[in-house]
Structure formats: C-alpha cells, structure tokens
C-alpha cells in the first residue's frame, strides 16, 4: 500500500483500542457534483429487467433508510413487451458500509458494518447445469 | 422518526461538536451471511448490458479501494450476440457512504462522505426526445 506521512495536526487518540476506534464527523460532505439524479431515477421501469424498490428502515443503523431492489420477473422483457424466460433478471449486489449503533440505542457510538444490498437488476443468459 | 430510549451504558461525549462527531469502531461486522458471491461475480460478462470494472484507489478514503462499473457498449447485446442500438446500456448508480481522512493523512480522524458509484449496467429502452 501507499504510506502517507502523518499530519502533525491530527487529534490524539487515548483510546486503548486505537486504531480500531476512531472519531468520525457525521457532517456529511457530498461529492456528487454535476450528477442528474432524474436521469437514472426511472431505469427501474425502463429496464428489460425491471425492479421494484423496497424501503428497509432500521433506526439502529446509519443511514437508517436503505432502498433494496427486487427484480419484478424471473425472465426479461422482450421487444414485444412480454416476459422472455430464455433470459433471466438478476439483482446486481454491492457491499456497502453502514454505521451500527453500538452499544444499542447510543447516539454517539457506532461500529462499522458491511451489508449486501441489491441496487438494481440486469438481464443475463442463464448458465445451464445438467443434473442427474 | 422512531424515538429510542438512550442506553445508560453509552460512552460520554465531551466533544463540543456532539452529536456531529462520534466514536466509530472500525472492526467491521459482516452481516452478509448465506450469500454466494460466486453466483453474481460473472454477471458483468453474461449481461445483455455488460460492463468492465475499474479500480478506484484513494488512500485518504476508507474503504480505499472501490470498483466502478463502466458499460462496454452504448447498445445492448441481442440474441445473436450483436450490439443492438435500439436499446441502451446504462449504469446503475448508488450513493454510498465512505470515510474521508480529515484532517488529511490522519489515521484516527474521519469525516463521512457521500459518493456516487456505478455498480453495474442494465439495458433500457431509450426515451425519444423530439427537438426543434
């Protein structure tokens, strides 16, 4: 990996678990400049592998609301608008980091957690397995 | 929102910016149980809107490595294996949270940051706009 010199202005850490426990500023900086969310907002409907979005809420997690994609069909939509079962709609999944309140119900203490979320769906050729 | 009673065993926060600055345990808890990553790992190749994955590395960010999807074609792959330009491959984007070292190069001080990543691609019917 890349070694970076430590900034002398860094806060001290007296925590015995350092570097496992760190200070995090929750004042979110949004780097998503020049993006037009409207453009991708309707892909879930226009896709050949359309999906529905389900709200997953957990007050012990930050962010507390996460949207999960569920593919509408097993097959994909063909040119005639019908479901074609020769192809399959599959979820595209991504591992994301969230903050979990630990101990529970604490406003200022968290633990990093890795969760798998389905972001949308794509249309794939199924792999054929010959079974006995 | 849901109000949760505060746990009396919570750590104290003497930070003047509380609750903006919190303690986070970086010992990641992985909730991805019963998932088979092999199943979705080759969707990028089998999709009708295939994509390539590009490594984005930033030592000032946690996680330092993020994989970005770039659609291979403007069109989608048809049943004959050719690119069909009546349809479009588009990236499915998701906003994710990362930790940014702040001040820079500090090992134990971070700020939450929201970034937009492309997770994969899906095949959509293009919207036709009639312009003058």
């Amino acid at each position: 990996g890349i070694t970076i010199p430590r900034n002398p202005g860094c806060p001290n850490s007296e925590d015995k678990n350092f570097p496992r426990t760190v200070m995090v500023n929750l004042n979110i900086h949004n780097r998503n400049t020049n993006t037009n969310p409207k453009r991708s907002s309707d892909y879930y409907n226009r896709s050949t592998s359309p999906w529905n979005l389900h709200r997953n809420e957990d007050p012990e997690r930050y962010p507390s609301v996460i949207w999960e994609a569920k593919c509408r069909h097993l097959g994909c939509i063909n040119a005639d608008g019908n479901v074609d079962y020769h192809m399959n709609s599959v979820p595209i999944q991504q591992e994301i980091l969230v903050l979990r309140r630990e101990p529970p119900h604490c406003p200022n203490s968290f633990r990093l957690e890795k969760i798998l979320v389905s972001v949308g769906c794509t249309c794939v050729t199924p792999i054929v397995h010959h079974v006995a | 929102g849901i109000t949760i009673p505060r746990n009396p065993g919570c750590p104290n926060s003497e930070d003047k910016n509380f609750p903006r600055t919190v303690m986070v345990n970086l010992n990641i808890h992985n909730r991805n149980t019963n998932t088979n990553p092999k199943r979705s790992s080759d969707y990028y190749n089998r999709s009708t809107s295939p994509w390539n994955l590009h490594r984005n590395e930033d030592p000032e960010r946690y996680p330092s490595v993020i994989w970005e999807a770039k659609c291979r074609h403007l069109g989608c792959i048809n049943a004959d294996g050719n690119v069909d330009y009546h349809m479009n491959s588009v990236p499915i984007q998701q906003e994710i949270l990362v930790l940014r070292r702040e001040p820079p190069h500090c090992p134990n001080s971070f700020r939450l940051e929201k970034i937009l990543v492309s997770v994969g691609c899906t095949c959509v019917t293009p919207i036709v706009h009639h312009v003058a």
Partner: nanobody
Framework: QVQLVESGGGLVRTGGSLRLSCSVS????????MGWYRQVPGRQRELVAM????????YYADSVKGRFTISRINANNTIYLQMNNLKPEDTAIYYC?????????MGQGTLVTVSS
Amino acid sequence: QVQLVESGGGLVRTGGSLRLSCSVSGDISSQSAMGWYRQVPGRQRELVAMIHTTKGDTYYADSVKGRFTISRINANNTIYLQMNNLKPEDTAIYYCTHNEPGDLYMGQGTLVTVSS
C-alpha cells in the same frame, strides 16, 4: 444441490395424450420457476412451458398453447405437463428444468415420440 427426477415419456399416436412429471429437490428460492424444455437433435432447445414457484404464473410456447397444460403440487415440488392432441412435430427429448435467477438446472430428459 438441485436434483430432478423425470418420468412419463413414451410412444404415442398422433392426437393422443401423455403426462410428464418431474420432482425437484434442493435449494429452491421464491424467485424461481420449474418447467420443460424440449430438444430435437441438431436443433435449438425450445422452452415449452414454465410455472413460477411462488406466484404460479405460467408460460407456454406458441406451438403448444391450448394443447399442453403445466401444473404444480407445492407440497412436494412436483410439476406435471399434460400433453393433449399430440402431433409428430412434438417428438423430442423433454427436459425438466428448475430455473433460479441466472442458473438453469436441467434433468436427463425423457423421450416423447409421436407417430403418425
């Protein structure tokens, strides 16, 4: 591991009927389907009929609509394909399939021969 056990193929005269059955065991998700493909040697495999595991939605190839009926007994994950008014062009090896999103499991096949 998915396992498929097929039965019910055979020789039948034009206009006759046959019933195929197939039982599936193993990991079955809520977003899966069971069905039948058929193949004539040297030709492309054709999806004949399919039934969704939980929704019960059915799909039929145009060539068999009105003649073939797919049904399912949920309790033991068994599907049936009732084939009526059979034609010589229905002659093929019929494969029971279990389709999980992205993966298609196919049985060993059962031969259906329709003689004129």
